[in-house]
């Protein structure tokens, strides 16, 4: 994206430049360099200092957002003298024109929706564009299908998530014929934005004394194994008084997901439904379809 880059430098400049596509800050190499460092300072005065690249005339910033504006700084010492240079990276354009209320979620294991709202001061002809880069910065994904509101892009639907990694950089650029539009950027973890489907293949089998519930873990976008899941079972006796508490049972994921509970014959009509979550986050899926067992005259 185009953004004003203003350099604050002494007479003999390092010619500091920043490529927002690769997040790479580079400068002119100096002979007999004894020390060099680069860092950025954001609007909240937080400092981020990445490792220098091997050639020591560039550095790459990984986990950073730029929409609030940042200042890059390079310090280089040579055997003769010291150099210092600042590079201001503002979010140019009219204040309040950037996309806002940006959020994304992954669903059905391989689909993603991102949505945003137009900036409050954005002109009528504003158009927004979404770009996604994975943490390895190897490829950029342009939004393939936009969701529109009166011709303005206010969301994006992706049905191919193969280019994503566990952490991804989202950039919403804006254009207008009238004024400059600010950009919005965000870093999102796929594990935090995935909404699981409920467990599948839920079955209940009962004998004279017990009932056994079995289910399969949901298919997910993240590569998760069985211990990464937590389940909740809602075993519910039908036709009970309103306000009667349901029995919620927590079950850790296993290779064979099952829950065996005492229930002797004759048993009243019950229903069971199950939901799933990532054990680390407990972002619960919706409930599975209720499965009924027992009889009305139990």
């Amino acid at each position: 994206e185009k953004s004003d880059l203003r350099t604050v430098a002494p007479a003999s400049s390092l010619n500091v430049r920043f490529d927002s596509r690769t997040m790479n800050l580079s400068w002119d190499c100096q002979e007999n360099t004894t020390f060099s460092k680069c860092f950025l300072t954001d609007k909240k005065n937080r400092v981020v200092e990445p490792r220098l690249s091997n050639n020591e005339c560039s550095c790459t910033f990984r986990e950073i957002c730029l929409h609030e504006g940042v200042t890059f700084e390079v310090h280089v010492n040579t055997s003769q003298r010291g150099f210092q240079q600042k590079l201001l990276y503002p979010n140019s354009g009219r204040e309040g024109t950037a996309a806002q209320n940006f959020s994304c979620f992954i669903y059905n294991a391989d689909l993603m929706n991102c949505t945003w709202a137009r900036g409050p001061t954005a002109p009528r002809d504003v158009q927004y564009f979404l770009y996604i880069r994975n943490s390895k910065r190897r490829r950029e994904i342009r939004c393939p299908y936009y969701i529109q509101d009166s011709g303005t892009h206010v969301g994006c639907h992706l049905d191919n998530l193969s280019g994503l990694t566990s952490r991804n950089y989202f950039l919403v650029n804006g254009t207008s014929r009238e004024i400059g539009i600010q950009f919005f950027d965000s870093l999102l973890d796929t594990k935090k934005i995935e909404r699981f489907n409920p467990p599948s293949n839920v079955t209940v089998r009962c004998n004279t004394t017990h009932c056994l519930v079995r289910w399969k873990q949901p298919r997910t976008y993240q590569k998760l194994s069985y211990l990464d899941f937590q389940y909740q079972l809602d075993v519910h006796r039908k036709n009970t008084q309103p306000g009667t508490e349901n029995l919620l049972i927590n079950v850790s994921g296993d290779l064979e997901n099952r829950y065996n509970f005492p229930s002797s014959e004759p048993r009243a009509k019950h229903s069971v439904k199950i939901r799933a979550a990532d054990v680390r986050i407990l972002n619960w899926s919706s409930w599975s379809e209720a499965i009924e067992f027992g009889s009305d005259d139990g």
């Epitope: 990694t165 566990s166 594990k191 993240q222 590569k223 998760l224 194994s225 069985y226 211990l227 990464d228 290779l255 990532d278 054990v279 680390r280």
Partner: antibody, heavy 120, light 111 residues
């Protein structure tokens, strides 16, 4: 019940290669991820490699890079670990294990182990 | 030399409580990556006791518990029994070596 059954003990000469198999029963290999861990006699556990979901490929511990190859035959639900240019320090029990958790790196269950002896 | 440090041995009388420590660094346990614990009885394969720092897989008695704080983790065993005599290993992930790592192991003796 999911089980991992490994191939029998092997005796190899220095410089040779060994290929250990790990057969999955009670589940299909495509639904699982296998990692390999070894244990020298009287010593601790050492991770060798396995499927990494972040990279979406099999990754190897640095010290085995170039000497180890891990493969899978999904038609027979069998995983293989081949170690080449064997030396006496490679004498160990080699285990395959199912990754029970990616986020927490936890292995369950394990194969029974395959003893590989490297001796001239 | 293991990246995760465990005491070589601990001991306790039947019925007692013992803890086994596992000390790492900012590139593994403190990163923060989760810790798992294994029990290895003589001549058998390791068995998972604890995962995600403090969760027990099905079939593991609640006498075993795990905790984590900063760059260290620990395994506690209460109501010690003769059959608990085994080697115990902690495990985590290390971002500097980009690999799964194990502690050197702790031999538990039931007196």
């Amino acid at each position: 019940q999911v089980q991992l059954v490994q191939s029998g003990a092997e005796v190899k000469k220095p410089g040779a290669s060994v290929k250990v198999s790990c057969k999955v029963s009670g589940y299909t290999l495509t639904e699982l991820s296998i990692h390999w861990v070894r244990q020298a006699p009287g010593k601790g556990l050492e991770w060798m490699g396995g499927f990494d979901p972040e990279e979406n490929e099999i990754v190897y511990a640095q010290r085995f890079q170039g000497r180890v190859t891990m493969t899978e035959d999904t038609s027979t639900d069998t995983a293989y670990m081949e170690l080449s240019s064997l030396r006496s320090e490679d004498t160990a029990v080699y285990y395959c294990a199912i990754v029970g958790s990616f986020s927490g790196i936890a292995y369950r269950p394990w194969g029974q182990g395959t003893m590989v002896t490297v001796s001239s | 030399q293991s990246v995760l440090t465990q005491p070589p041995s601990v001991s306790g009388a039947p019925g007692q409580r013992v803890t086994i420590s596992c000390t790492g660094s900012g590139s593994n346990i403190g990163a923060p990556y989760d810790v798992s614990w294994y029990q290895q009885l003589p001549g058998t394969a390791p068995k998972l006791l604890i995962y995600h720092n403090n969760k027990r897989p099905s079939g593991v008695p609640d006498r075993f518990s795990g905790s984590k704080s900063g760059t260290s983790a620990s395994l506690a065993i209460t109501g010690l029994q003769a059959e608990d005599e085994a080697d115990y290993y902690c495990q985590s992930y290390d971002s500097s070596s980009i690999s799964t790592i194990f502690g050197g192991g702790t031999k538990l003796t039931v007196l």
